[in-house]
């Protein structure tokens, strides 16, 4: 498909006078951060983006790769690099103690420096690294955590919380002896470790005592609380603030979204992950969407500012199942919510960045003809006389022989939402990718996200663009009409 | 392995404020360009961009990923829309088209608007696009092109050609009835579309009559002249310049680079394409960093300024076969091009940009640890209870079963220059990927890359930065000193 | 409380056509998989098709067996799932399920049934 | 498409038995299998999903596991109104039921 505007090199030479023209214009602010918000997409390497922006692109009925995403619009880009001290390719928790606090740490710890060793409670205390979330309330700003995984899981974790194990999700999945010496499950984190204003996303039945059914699945024994200290970390939060609400459906989240009277919102809308948005049921989950605006709603009321997580958090779910349908329907969801994030907020005052803490050996390959489906066939067959998807991963749980050969796959079937793109190596869950990934940045200070940087740089330049700890003394003017 | 400095977050809090500190220092110069330089690693997408790093820190004696490639120095990124206007996933030809004539075009295709159709000769004329180095020549300047393929391969011959097959190299390679229509073979393009002052890589064959023996391997015929017309290309493009050069080998570069009486170079030290760096005679075949060291030489004589095309050209074409190996060994030769040229020039009056044309179904996954070798295993076995790599295709040669199943594979196999790794589709050849790819850069107006472009944006923000066509009018400053 | 009630099953000649509905309630009927089982006297469990929901393009599936013969549709608007079978065989004789998925472990596993409808093809 | 291979196809046991009845799948189903329980003239009932996950209301003397091809489904102690016959369920690609196990009390 060749459009036929685009055969006339006036075309290319107008949209990139245009855009000349426009980076021309660009004006680093020099002014601080009122607001910050950081968009994770876990999982989302550069094969993602452009993947995901096809898509999009495609369900506007439009060619696909000529459109924009929300982030792609942001003026500036880098490059992060993303190994932690342990290893070439990392995992989310690790990733996220860098980017959230600024220092690298091990695979599979979250908020400790790489002194920590993974699932060795002794080695916690002393090497925690505290967040750029937990400045931010220090500096009297509102804080939220949003994400489409359990609030409990790698990625917002490293926003509150310090543990050698990424998975002590309960203290159900935390050993007796780690419990001993003092370990504390991330839940039980979450609400103790500082005061979060907005909580919102899945992992309800890690902060109820064990046999409290689910009130959305209680025919569901494996849905129900998990928790043996017999606690209801719901109730305690709920106490702990006057104007404190606690929900679980979208109902009740959009309710007290508007509610002047709540001050503190914790929305767990599942038991574990939230559903993936192609499964989710619209009357009682909230969308990602929906939950960043609920948060935002809540959060822009403080004059100090605020700062806002939100993960899109099973882009990385459904690379890992090597069913690219999910992954990339997720990818949408999330630049979904960093467009909404956009209408609500101003880049005059609010610095906003998009990253992901890792990739995935996902590519997109085969020459496919502009405008056809990205998961559809490659043209021609392989070597094997077999069709083959553009979509494949390196390893992952799609490799499957069939009477000792490689399946042959119709264009019905890898446009099925539930298709299995083929990998090289068979593995029980296909894995991340080291190679660098993007970072995109808008307001104040976002000039400084540039060339290629570590990991750590993201949660500095946050720091740095709001005046936090440790540069206090960051000789940024305040923004004209800011309120303290 | 765990580097002791690392387990302290002063490492990480300290080198973070270092690099915020770089960033701050960050000024935007008001001044055109006088030099300009595009490095064009072929296939070079970000997944190889950060395997290389590696590689090549290890070559160091480091762990790896905490090094500095000489590309990643450069403080500006953007990412760039690869896509042809036909394809989602682009070839060299029409991806030449883009960041080099700043249109594009369609696959296949080069110098060429998207009004051009594929092996359609008649559909040539009237639709040729001009390159920035045209455009550069025509404005005073000198200008070269430098690579590792043969000089008449897709991504240099989008400097200066127009044809509808990427694969016309010499008249033989040319149909009789496109001959007779009036299309020009690359080879004929090379010598006469423009005056190129240096051109340096492979592809003797092509300049030469049909029987006339390569120097350099004159007992084998298929190394020879290919020329059907009978015509010596190099014999009339010697015949242009009063002080112009022919060289073929590296000793007669190095000479002809350091005579002040050369004014025109053209080194062509292999029949089709260079060797793998790998493979490379360090006697008679020159490196990329000294073709480019030569280049510069010769070219930085000219007071107008210069522009230059570089090109690691067979990082590509290691992938195509996949084997990382040479992909990345390749990879590093360019790297070390880039960073000669830093060293060779001023980047107060050059504008030096890198980026991929593509990039390639090529991951790096698997959980290594960190220190381990790029070519080595990942930790523990695949679901068949096989070892596998931790770099990965998704598609390509590497694909074979043995006795109806995966291949094991030990670390010394996948470590030998010649392992293929394994992928998910067999193919002849491994395809290239669609996802976008960085560009990084330095320089005056290096500023003006940024944020996600179309990778047509390159070529014009080449033009802009040195008052080319169509932006003479470009209202810069020239640098202080520069002559005309 | 979720909800499946199927009806249009009865005696039915072969080669002719018969079509299902199952009604549904208790439940976004957008925003769920809805497929259709049968079971032959005697014998065991067999799925024939499956429709998706508004997110992911109500795309459809259908075991080989019926393919070609049987189609699945939904009515948004009632929330009624159907299907519509033709060319019947005497061995199409069996007890019809519909039935609603829950993605529990992101699994589209089948967590409500209806109570069945009988279809006898015979002359 | 995925075809699954229950075994046995009828079991007679006596009440507190362990009754084990296993599926093998012909390829990887990622632990997407659910277990059922039909009495004459019902509709199936799920009784695990996942593998292992036990819907609530059922006892816990039934149990699964398993991973890749294999998986078992497990009734600790065989009680009179576990009288049904039991279908192993592929959700990995689409739907397979298993060929069904009638289960006896002897």
């Known amino acids: 498909i060749i459009p036929v505007e685009e055969e006339n090199p006036d075309f290319w030479n107008r949209q990139a006078a245009e855009a000349l023209g426009a980076a021309k214009k660009l004006q680093p602010a020099q002014t601080a951060a009122k607001n910050l918000i950081i968009f994770l997409g876990d999982g989302m390497g550069v094969s993602t983006v452009t993947a995901a922006r096809i898509l999009k692109g495609q369900k506007k009925d439009k060619l696909g790769p000529e459109t924009f995403l929300a982030m792609d619009r942001f003026p500036y880009v880098a490059l992060s690099k993303t190994y932690s001290v342990d290893k070439h390719v990392p995992d989310s928790g690790a990733t996220a103690t860098a980017y959230l606090c600024g220092v690298k740490g091990n695979f599979q710890t979250i908020g400790l420096s790489a002194a920590a060793r993974f699932n060795q409670c002794n080695t916690t205390r002393g090497n925690e690294v505290i967040s750029v979330m937990n400045r931010a309330k220090k500096a009297g700003k509102s804080v939220g955590v949003v994400t489409t995984t359990r609030v409990q899981h790698a990625s917002p974790a490293g926003a509150y919380a310090h543990t050698v194990n990424r998975n002590w999700y309960s203290d159900a999945d935390v050993p007796a002896s780690a419990r001993q010496e003092g370990c504390q499950d991330i839940a039980t984190q979450l609400i103790s470790n500082m005061d979060i204003d907005v909580i919102l996303g899945g992992g309800r039945k890690y902060m109820f005592p064990m046999g409290t059914p689910d009130p959305e699945y209680p025919d569901d024994y494996s849905q129900g609380g998990t928790r043996l200290d017999g606690k209801n970390l719901v109730q305690e939060w709920l106490a702990k603030h006057q104007g404190a609400r606690y929900v679980w459906n979208r109902t009740e989240l959009l309710q007290a979204s508007l509610d002047p009277s709540v001050t503190h919102l914790m929305g767990l809308f599942e038991p574990g992950d939230m559903k993936y948005e192609i499964h989710r049921d619209s009357t009682l989950d909230p969308s990602l969407m929906e939950m960043t605006e609920a948060a935002l709603l809540l959060l822009s009321r403080n004059p100090r500012g605020f700062f806002l997580f939100v993960e899109g958090g099973r882009i990385d779910h459904g690379h890992h199942e090597s069913r690219a349908y999910r992954a990339l329907t997720e990818t949408i969801m999330f630049d979904d919510a960093i467009e909404r994030a956009g209408q609500l907020t101003s880049e005059e005052d609010t610095l906003s960045l998009v990253t992901a803490d890792h990739s995935h050996v996902f590519s997109f390959g085969g020459y496919p003809l502009r405008g056809s489906s990205i998961f559809g066939l490659a043209p021609g067959k392989a070597r094997d006389r077999k069709a083959y998807t553009v979509l494949l991963y390196g390893n992952g749980p799609g490799y499957v022989l069939k009477d000792g050969a490689r399946p042959d796959v119709t264009e019905s079937e890898s446009g099925s939402p539930e298709y299995r793109q083929q990998s090289a190596v068979p593995l029980d869950g296909e894995t991340h990718a080291g190679e660098d990934v993007a970072v995109f940045a808008r307001g104040p200070q976002a000039h400084l996200v540039h060339g290629v940087q570590e990991q750590t740089f993201i949660a500095h330049v946050m720091a740095f663009a709001a005046c936090l700890e440790p540069y206090t003394a960051c000789d940024l003017a305040p923004r004209a009409g800011t309120t303290d | 392995i765990i580097p002791v400095e690392e387990e302290n977050p002063d490492f990480w809090n300290r080198q973070a404020a270092e690099a915020l500190g770089a960033a701050k220092k960050l000024q935007p110069a008001q001044t055109a360009a006088k030099n300009l330089i595009i490095f064009l690693g072929d296939g070079m997408g970000v997944s190889t961009v950060t395997a290389a790093r590696i590689l090549k820190g290890q070559k160091k004696d480091k762990l790896g990923p905490e090094t500095f490639l000489a590309m990643d120095r450069f403080p500006y990124v953007a990412l760039s829309k690869t896509y042809s206007v036909d394809k989602h996933v682009p070839d060299s030809g029409a991806t030449a088209t883009a960041y080099l004539c700043g249109v594009k075009g369609n696959f296949q295709t080069i110098g060429l608007s998207a009004a051009a159709r594929f092996n359609q000769c008649n559909t040539t004329r009237g639709n040729e696009v001009i390159s920035v180095m045209n455009r550069a020549k025509k404005a005073g300047k000198s200008v070269g092109v430098v690579t590792t393929t043969r000089v008449q391969h897709a991504s240099p011959a989008g400097a200066y050609a127009h044809t509808v097959n990427r694969n016309w190299y010499s008249d033989a390679d040319v149909p009789a009835s496109a001959r007779q229509e009036g299309c020009q073979d690359i080879a004929t393009q090379l010598i006469s579309n423009m005056d190129i002052d240096v051109i340096l890589g492979g592809g003797r064959k092509y300049m030469f009559p049909m029987g006339t023996p390569d120097p350099e391997y004159p007992d084998d015929y298929s190394q020879g002249g290919t020329r059907l017309d009978g015509k010596n290309l190099v014999q009339e493009w010697l015949a242009k310049h009063q002080g112009a050069r022919y060289v073929w080998n590296r000793t007669e570069l190095l000479q002809a680079s350091l005579d002040p009486s050369v004014t025109h170079l053209m080194g062509l030290f292999e029949p089709g394409d260079m060797k793998y760096e790998i493979h490379r005679d360090s006697t008679l075949d020159p490196s990329l960093m000294e073709m480019t060291e030569a280049a510069l030489l010769l070219l930085s004589r000219n007071p107008r300024g210069f522009f230059l095309f570089v090109e690691g050209g067979r990082i590509d074409h290691g992938h195509h076969e996949s084997r990382a190996y040479r992909a990345l060994t390749e990879t590093i030769m360019f790297d070390d091009a880039i960073e000669r040229a830093g060293q060779l020039t001023s980047e107060e009056d050059t504008l030096s940009l890198v980026t991929a044309d593509h990039s390639h179904v090529f991951s790096f996954g698997g959980y290594p640890l960190r220190g381990s070798s790029i070519f080595g295993l990942a930790p523990g076995k695949a679901r068949d209870r096989k070892a596998y790599t931790v770099l990965l295709y998704g598609n390509g040669p590497g694909y074979v079963l043995k006795d109806g199943a995966r291949p094991d594979v030990t670390e010394s196999e996948s470590g030998s220059p010649e392992y293929r790794q394994q992928s998910a589709v067999p193919l002849d050849g491994e395809t290239h990927a669609g996802e976008d790819v960085a560009v990084f850069a330095r320089g005056p107006q290096a500023h003006l890359v940024h944020g996600v472009q179309e990778q047509t944006f390159i070529a014009h923000v080449m033009a802009f930065a040195a008052c080319l066509e169509p932006y003479t009018a470009c209202d810069l400053a020239p640098r202080a000193g520069t002559t005309d | 409380e979720v909800q499946l009630v199927e009806s249009g099953g009865g005696l039915v000649q072969p080669g002719r056509s018969l079509r299902l509905s199952c009604t549904a309630s208790?439940?976004?009927?957008?925003?769920?998989?809805m497929s259709w089982f049968r079971q032959a006297p005697g014998k065991g469990l067999e799925w024939l098709a499956l429709?998706?929901?508004?997110?992911?393009?109500?795309?459809?599936e259908y075991s080989a067996s019926v393919k070609g013969r049987f189609t699945i549709s939904r009515d948004n608007s009632k929330s009624i799932l159907y299907l519509q079978m033709n060319s019947l065989k005497t061995e199409d004789t069996a007890v019809y399920y519909c039935?609603?998925?829950?993605?529990?472990?992101?699994?589209?596993?089948?967590?409500?049934w209806g109570q069945g409808t009988l279809v006898t093809v015979s002359s | 498409d995925t075809q699954m291979t229950q075994s046995p196809s009828s079991l007679s046991a006596s009440v507190g038995d362990r009754v084990t009845i296993t599926c093998q799948a012909s390829?990887?189903?990622?632990?997407?299998i659910a277990w059922y329980q039909q009495k004459p003239g019902k509709a199936p009932k799920l009784l695990i999903h996942?593998?292992?996950s036990l819907q609530s209301g059922v006892p816990s003397r039934f149990s699964g596991s398993g991973s890749g091809r294999d998986y078992t489904f497990t009734i600790s102690s065989l009680q009179p109104e576990d009288i049904a016959t039991y279908y192993c369920?592929?959700?990995?690609?689409?739907?397979?039921f298993g060929q069904g196990t009638k289960l006896e009390i002897k």
């Open positions: 039935a609603r998925a829950s993605f529990y472990y992101d699994g589209k596993v089948l967590a409500y």
């Open positions: 208790g439940f976004t009927f957008t925003d769920y998989y």
């Open positions: 429709i998706r929901n508004k997110a992911t393009g109500y795309t459809t």
């Open positions: 390829q990887d189903i990622n632990k997407y």
């Open positions: 996942y593998t292992s």
């Open positions: 369920l592929q959700y990995d690609n689409l739907y397979t």
